[in-house]
């Protein structure tokens, strides 16, 4: 028997990805980060 139509059993959460670069002084270079949902992960 064919399956009746239903949505997938899991929910997709859409999150904003924000790349940022911060200048921390001429002798320390720059920090480049990736923020996902408010948490810096890289």
């Amino acid at each position: 028997d064919a399956e009746f139509r239903h949505d997938s059993g899991y929910e997709v959460h859409h999150q904003k990805l924000v790349f940022f670069a911060e200048d921390v002084g001429s002798n320390k270079g720059a920090i480049i980060g990736l923020m996902v949902g408010g948490v810096v992960i890289a």
Epitope: D1, A2, E3, F4, R5, H6, D7, S8, G9, Y10, E11
Partner: antibody
Framework: QVTLKESGPGILKPSQTLSLTCSLS??????????VGWFRQPSGKGLEWLAH???????SYNPSLKSRLTISKYTSRNQVFLTITSVDTADTATYYC???????????????WGQGTSVTVSS | DVLMTQTPLSLPVSLGDQASISCRSS???????????LEWYLQKPGQSPKLLIY???NRFSGVPDRFSGSGSGTDFTLKISRVEAEDLGVYYC?????????FGAGTKLELK
């Protein structure tokens, strides 16, 4: 509030085409995930699923009756239709429509039913 | 087609009793999305069916907590902890996972 109301001819003769209408209120057929199905129940007997139509015009039919069934909708009028060709006395039943909405925030079950319309096929 | 077998077909009870209705499907009704679309409906005389339980064990809005659903795979149960007069009628199990969608034959809950 959410309501569904079936209407039909009441009585028709064998070999004729049965046309049923389900009029919806309190919700929109254009809402993503929304669907309406048709069911029937001969007097004193059990329930049988006939067909279902979704907001995006996807349709599903009971294979045992598929050759005789056509489900369709008129979204702007919030109506769903079912036609059954070449009716016989075995098609005598109360016909119900019910809504079923897809989606993870929906219960995905027949949560509201119409009161039914009685159809008799007799020569 | 998935055959839904309900037992018993008739269930005489006294008010306040616990009632239990069994429903067995002829094959698994676990959908590929991980959900089992097993539902219970109550139909009172002269009325349309009303949803009680969906996805095996979830009570629909407004359904008293004396109703509970359980099961998995092919075996499912509806329990009514303390039967009230308004609970009398015919109970149908239903599977919404596979085409054609199918109902059990119904269980008539009636007074002894």
């Amino acid at each position: 509030q959410v309501t569904l109301k079936e209407s039909g001819p009441g009585i028709l003769k064998p070999s004729q085409t049965l046309s049923l209408t389900c009029s919806l209120s309190g919700f929109s057929l254009s809402t993503s995930g929304m669907g309406v199905g048709w069911f029937r129940q001969p007097s004193g007997k059990g329930l049988e699923w006939l067909a279902h139509i979704w907001w995006d015009d996807d349709k599903s039919y009971n294979p045992s009756l598929k050759s005789r069934l056509t489900i369709s909708k008129y979204t702007s009028r919030n109506q769903v239709f079912l036609t059954i060709t070449s009716v016989d006395t075995a098609d005598t039943a109360t016909y119900y429509c019910a809504r079923r909405q897809l989606g993870l925030r929906s219960i995905d079950a027949m949560d509201y039913w119409g009161q039914g319309t009685s159809v008799t096929v007799s020569s | 087609d998935v055959l839904m077998t309900q037992t018993p077909l008739s269930l005489p009870v006294s008010l306040g009793d616990q009632a239990s209705i069994s429903c067995r499907s002829s094959q698994s009704i676990l959908h590929s999305n991980g959900n089992t679309y097993l539902e219970w409906y109550l139909q009172k005389p002269g009325q349309s069916p009303k949803l009680l339980i969906y996805k095996v064990s979830n009570r629909f809005s407004g359904v008293p907590d004396r109703f509970s659903g359980s099961g998995s795979g092919t075996d499912f149960t509806l329990k009514i902890s303390r039967v009230e007069a308004e609970d009398l009628g015919v109970y149908y199990c239903f599977q919404g996972s596979l085409v054609p969608l199918t109902f059990g034959a119904g269980t008539k809950l009636e007074l002894k």
